[in-house]
Interface confidence: medium
């Protein structure tokens, strides 16, 4: 219970994408404000937020410190003006978030080809290292940085006259395939960590054909 | 020449522990996860789990979880499969196998040679 | 977990002979499929991953097919050293599974 002029937040939702973690929830707020915390199961709670009519709060900084824990988010009601006004039980209404692990969790986002280089019947094709908000020693790091072994990348490849597909997986960032000299391919790539239960599979990135600017042909 | 050498047939009896090895030579052991196959006499193959020897990250086959456990030593580039307690129906042919392109999620390219194990009483 | 289905279980063949095996998968598993020869008191070996990709050091005469649910196993002319049982493996989602094996025979 709280007063009779703050309602309860709802529908608490991580958005997460390569770690970027914003929480988002209802109602937009009429006559009443929010403030968010955030909490490893064993640790502390911490104030974002403060006082804010926005429905979502980033909570990228504070996630990024350890992806690996298990987070927990709650969102206060205030009325607006008065926020130091507290429920009946001498608290502000509060709801809290589902957990989330930024490792097993974060969507993979989008990923793109960086380039790509014909050298005679074979195809080396490299995927952009995206950079992530994570941080070792002052420095971001990428998405290879942070997953390591888990996350794969498949490419999805064919013949620009035709539609029948062929894949290929690499764990690292380069595929080196093989291709019939004097076609023309076209590729796409997906970001994949096989080991997860959930949010498995990034969307696919952009198509890239052979005689765009991006590639470069070398014929040996 | 890549490769994974077994070690040698085993026999058992029910209770006993045991624990059996595949060493790797020829590529690079750390960087490439190590599978076990299970090939009851008779049967087919029946994938078990595998691990990582770079850091010991293991997956194992629900059907397998808490029968086996899957190590490795990566100094002497080895990995192990073992039981705490046989059973008669651990008997069958375990095979090592490699992941092709040292990732968990891959189809295997080379085999060790098997080790038998058979457990009577 | 994934089931995967090979047909038929054994068949007769001779020298020369082409021969097709199939597998098909519960649920859609892409080209993440691999064949294995097994002969008899040896090792699996280990022939085309990727549904498609031959293995290297494996002969010509043996080719993959397929995507999605159905996959083929062709050896274009069979050799003695051919006869041997042949099983499919999807490594498309955990736990990999393999097929029941079909096993190829002399005539």
């Known amino acids: 219970s709280g007063t009779t002029n703050t309602v309860a937040a709802y529908n608490l939702t991580w958005k997460s994408t390569n770690f970027k973690t914003i929480l988002e929830w209802e109602p937009k707020p009429v006559n009443q404000v929010y403030t968010v915390q955030i909490s490893t199961k064993s640790g502390d709670w911490k104030s974002k937020c403060f006082y804010t009519t926005d429905t979502e709060c980033d909570l990228t900084d504070e996630i990024v410190k350890d992806v690996k824990q298990t987070y927990l988010a709650r969102v206060f009601s205030y009325p607006a003006g008065n926020v130091e006004s507290t429920g009946s039980a001498g608290e502000p209404l509060y709801e809290n978030s589902p957990e989330f692990t930024p490792y097993l969790e974060t969507n993979l986002g989008q990923p793109t080809i960086q380039s790509f280089e014909q050298v005679g019947t074979k195809v080396n094709v490299t995927v952009e290292d995206e950079r992530t908000l994570v941080r070792r020693n002052n420095t971001f790091l990428s998405l290879r940085d942070v997953f390591g072994k888990d996350l794969i990348y498949t490419l999805y490849y064919w013949k620009s006259s035709s539609s029948g597909k062929k894949t290929a997986k690499t764990n690292t960032n380069e595929f080196l395939i093989d291709v019939d000299k004097g076609e023309n391919y076209c590729f796409s790539v997906q970001a994949v960590i096989p080991s997860r239960t959930v949010n498995r599979k990034s969307t696919d990135s952009p198509v890239e054909c052979m005689g765009q600017e991006k590639g470069e042909f070398r014929e040996i | 020449e890549v490769q994974l050498v077994q070690s040698g047939a085993e026999v058992k009896k029910p209770g006993e522990s045991l624990k059996i090895s595949c060493k790797g030579s020829?590529?690079?052991?750390?960087?490439?996860?190590i599978g076990w196959v299970r090939q009851m006499p008779g049967k087919g193959l029946e994938w078990m789990g595998i691990?990582?020897?770079?850091?010991?990250?293991?997956r194992y086959s629900p059907s397998f979880q808490g029968q086996v456990t899957i190590s490795a030593d990566k100094s002497i580039s080895t990995a192990y499969l073992q039981w705490s307690s046989l059973k008669a129906s651990d008997t069958a042919m375990y095979y090592c196998?490699?992941?092709?392109?040292?990732?968990?999620?891959?189809?295997?390219?080379?085999w060790g040679q098997g080790t038998m194990v058979t457990v009577s009483s | 977990d994934i089931q995967m289905t090979q047909s038929p279980s054994s068949l007769s063949a001779s020298v020369g002979d082409r021969v097709t095996i199939t597998c098909r998968a519960s649920?859609?598993?892409?080209?993440?499929l691999a064949w294995y020869q097994q002969k008899p008191e040896k090792a699996p070996k280990s022939l085309i991953y990727?549904?498609?990709s031959l293995q290297s050091g494996v002969p010509s005469r043996f080719s993959g097919s397929g995507s999605g649910t159905d996959f083929t196993l062709t050896i274009s002319s069979l050799q003695p050293e051919d006869f041997a049982t042949y099983y499919c493996?999807?490594?498309?989602?955990?736990?990999?599974?393999f097929g029941q094996g079909t096993t190829v025979e002399v005539k």
């Open positions: 649920q859609g598993i892409s080209s993440w």
């Open positions: 020829g590529y690079s052991f750390t960087s490439c996860w």
């Open positions: 196998a490699r992941h092709k392109l040292g990732m968990d999620h891959d189809a295997f390219d080379i």
């Open positions: 691990i990582y020897p770079g850091d010991s990250d293991t």
């Open positions: 990727a549904a498609s």
């Open positions: 493996q999807q490594y498309n989602s955990y736990p990999p599974t």
